[in-house]
């Protein structure tokens, strides 16, 4: 069964996939595809790396982490409900039938509908509600959108919740590292 990951409409989705290169720069081809992993390669390829670089990608799909160190986790930008489904990460380890393949299920939830702010409009316009969470590579910024009035304590609480959520994901995903060599 697939490991399940969740994101909201309009957010960036993160699908983890890792391997440990045998030596620095000794990379292994990896493909990401929409749909479960087929018998060879990936179906409906959205991104592909070779021994040196990312050699194929499509819009909204990118590697946020350091793929040269084996972090080939996929980021899908600005997701919609249509992005829901199974994704395949295939690590094409050299040898006879050595591939490692992972099916990851992405569940997209509708964005939370919240009432527009009624007070402090100038504050809202001047300071968009953005929280930065720890990511794998460049920090990901998650926009909270039109929230009702909120105080600094609530912002701190939200930041902690986002951080803890990401940390939980990190801990859950830490067992999915493939060591090569």
């Amino acid at each position: 069964s697939e490991v399940e990951y969740r994101a909201e409409v309009g957010q960036n989705a993160y699908l983890p996939c890792f391997y440990t290169p045998a030596a620095p720069g000794n990379l292994v081809p990896v493909c990401w595809g929409k749909g479960a992993c087929p018998v060879f390669e990936c179906g409906n390829v959205v991104l592909r790396t070779d021994e040196r670089d990312v050699n194929y990608w499509t819009s909204r799909y990118w590697l946020n982490g350091d793929f040269r160190k084996g972090d080939v986790s996929l980021t899908i930008e600005n997701v919609t409900l249509a992005d829901s489904g199974i994704y395949c990460c295939r690590i094409q380890i050299p040898g006879i039938m050595n591939d490692e393949k992972f099916n990851l299920k992405l569940v997209i939830k509708p964005a939370k509908v919240t009432p527009a702010p009624t007070r402090q409009r100038d504050f809202t316009a001047a300071f968009p509600r953005m929280l930065t969470t720890r990511g794998h590579g460049p920090a990901e910024t998650q926009t909270l959108g039109s929230l009702p009035d909120i105080n600094l304590t609530q912002i701190s609480t939200l930041a902690n919740e986002l951080r803890d959520s990401r940390l939980a994901n990190d801990l859950r995903d830490s067992g999915a590292t493939i060591r090569i060599g």
């Epitope: 060879f40 179906g43 390829v45 199974i86 094409q92 040898g95 591939d99």
Partner: antibody
Framework: EVQLLESGGGLVQPGGSLRLSCAAS????????FSWVRQAPGKGLEWVSA????????YYADSVKGRFTISRDNSKNTLYLQMNSLRAEDTAVYYC??????????WGQGTLVTVSS | DIVMTQSPSSLSASVGDGVTITCQAS??????LNWYQQKPGKAPKLLIY???SLPIGVPSRFSGSGSGTDFTLTISSLQPEDFATYYC?????????FGQGTKLEIK
């Protein structure tokens, strides 16, 4: 023109060896996985072996594992199948086929391998 | 190995007829089902991939459907050049496996 052209088939005795070649033209050979698929006389299709675009990942059917070796030379746009310890049941037409988006979308014309004493 | 079972094994029909060939997988194959057409002495030709997608150049009278374990190939109005043997093939589990074939003959 996009095409695959097999060669190297023939009559060989049981226990003998043969090397098949598949020359590709008209497309970016190194970008694709390739397979060998065989068809015994009057029978259906049987997948034999596959190889990744860079040639470093290979795959074999149990029936040929340890006897057949698939390889490719991307500088020559050529796919190979080295067949050793041949048996009567290996008698078939051998096709090379390009694998694209989960289907074998381009096939050669086939080359006949007959294993008989 | 995933076993692919085609039915019928042979079929007689006339030009202009519509025909359906079925293929059943021994386990779910996530829609990774291809159909091929083969004429005597020739290589197979890909007709349908991923259960229902037509490669460029394949006439629209050919269509595929199905999911999970059960799939069908439909030819809406047979043409003289359609009389051939048809194979299904799964591309999900290792190794890739083919059905035993369905021979479509002129009635």
């Amino acid at each position: 023109e996009v095409q695959l052209l097999e060669s190297g088939g023939g009559l060989v005795q049981p226990g003998g060896s043969l090397r098949l070649s598949c020359a590709a033209s008209g497309f970016s050979f190194s970008s694709f996985y390739f397979s060998w698929v065989r068809q015994a006389p009057g029978k259906g299709l049987e997948w034999v072996s596959a190889i990744s675009g860079n040639g470093r990942s290979t795959y074999y059917a149990d029936s040929v594992k340890g006897r057949f070796t698939i390889s490719r030379d991307n500088s020559k746009n050529t796919l190979y199948l080295q067949m050793n310890s041949l048996r009567a049941e290996d008698t078939a037409v051998y096709y090379c086929a390009r694998y694209y988006n989960t289907g074998f979308d381009l096939w050669g014309q086939g080359t006949l391998v007959t294993v008989s004493s | 190995d995933i076993v692919m079972t085609q039915s019928p094994s042979s079929l007689s029909a006339s030009v202009g007829d519509g025909v359906t060939i079925t293929c059943q997988a021994s386990e779910a194959i996530y829609g990774y089902l291809n159909w091929y057409q083969q004429k005597p002495g020739k290589a197979p030709k890909l007709l349908i991939y991923a259960a229902s997608s037509l490669p460029i150049g394949v006439p629209s009278r050919f269509s595929g459907s199905g999911s999970g374990t059960d799939f069908t190939l439909t030819i809406s109005s047979l043409q003289p050049e359609d009389f051939a043997t048809y194979y299904c093939q799964q591309a999900y589990g290792f190794p890739p496996t083919f059905g035993q074939g369905t021979k479509l003959e002129i009635k």
